[in-house]
Interface confidence: medium
């Protein structure tokens, strides 16, 4: 199958890197600055990514290969192949329209990215809250009353059972 | 998981127009070049056209130039077949088909590409 090809199109010659240019007889020319072909046989070479602004070069463009960008510092790649920067918030925050803004009260965020979560229900396990939650940081949950020897305690009480999303103060 | 499925095929008469897409999922769609092919009954398999990761460039086989239209929505993670004055002869299971970042084969031949869909079939006939 390629080696008939090869024979119908002169073009299957031209490998990575060059392109098959039509305006000087199909000889294969090397892909021009800013451009690559990642496989044989192209008619074109394909133009680099750019990272501008937010973006910084990950990656640099090669002659065979596209750039790749990354975020400069403060902000985080978002969507496939960082198609994104957005702007990174302090652990204890989440990043809304208005900006960063601290967690509400009984969720956190330990990530300079993303949404602040609920603590977790250590009474939905049927265990005690064994450290307080914080803004940056979510409960850790203790063994419950029953799993500890005669003479022993949790920290705190136990939960109470509550809503979701809900923390004791 | 990457995966790629076709959609839009169907019985046309000559002459007549159909619009193929190819809806990709579980990567970085607009990082990587994208071809559709085609397999007739008992012929190997064809290629038809190649769009670059950013739509700026594309590579047709003869047979389809200026009747066949690859385009691509990389903000939607799809790639599209515009077939229009088709023939008998572009009766065929159609597929997509997503580049490798890296070949040394020629861009038309299937070794290139290195995830396809399952196939669309185009029937053109009176």
């Known amino acids: 199958f390629e080696r008939t090809r090869s024979l119908q199109d002169p073009c299957s010659n031209c490998p990575a890197g060059t392109f098959c240019d039509n305006n000087r007889n199909q000889i294969c020319s090397p892909c021009p600055p800013n451009s690559f072909s990642s496989a044989g046989g192209q008619r074109t070479c394909d133009i680099c990514r750019q990272c501008k602004g937010v973006f910084r070069t990950r990656k640099e463009c090669s002659s065979t290969s596209n750039a790749e960008c990354d975020c400069t510092p403060g902000f985080h790649c978002l969507g496939a192949g960082c198609s994104m920067c957005e702007q990174d918030c302090k652990q204890g925050q989440e990043l809304t329209k208005k900006g960063c803004k601290d967690c509400c009260f009984g969720t956190f965020n330990d990530q300079k990215r993303g949404i602040c979560r609920p603590w977790t229900n250590c009474s939905l396990d049927g265990k005690s809250v064994l450290v307080n939650g914080t803004k940056e940081r979510d409960v850790v949950c203790g063994p419950s009353p029953a799993d500890l020897s005669p003479g022993a305690s949790s920290v705190t009480p136990p939960a109470p059972a509550r809503e979701p999303g809900h923390s004791p103060q | 998981e990457v995966q790629l499925l076709e959609s839009g095929g169907g019985e046309v008469q000559p002459g007549g127009s159909l619009r193929l897409s190819c809806a990709a999922s579980g990567w970085a769609f607009g990082n990587y070049g994208m071809a559709w092919f085609r397999q007739a009954p008992g012929k190997e398999r064809e290629f038809i056209g190649r769009?670059?990761?950013?739509?700026?460039?594309?590579d047709y086989v003869e047979s389809v130039k200026g009747r066949f239209t690859i385009s691509r929505d990389n903000a939607k993670n799809t790639l599209y077949l515009q077939m229009s004055s088709l023939r008998a002869e572009d009766t065929a299971v159609y597929y997509c088909a997503r580049q490798r970042s890296y070949s040394r084969y020629d861009i038309r031949t299937p070794q290139t590409y290195d995830y396809w869909g399952q196939g669309t079939l185009v029937t053109v006939k009176p």
């Open positions: 769009l670059a990761w950013n739509g700026g460039s594309t």
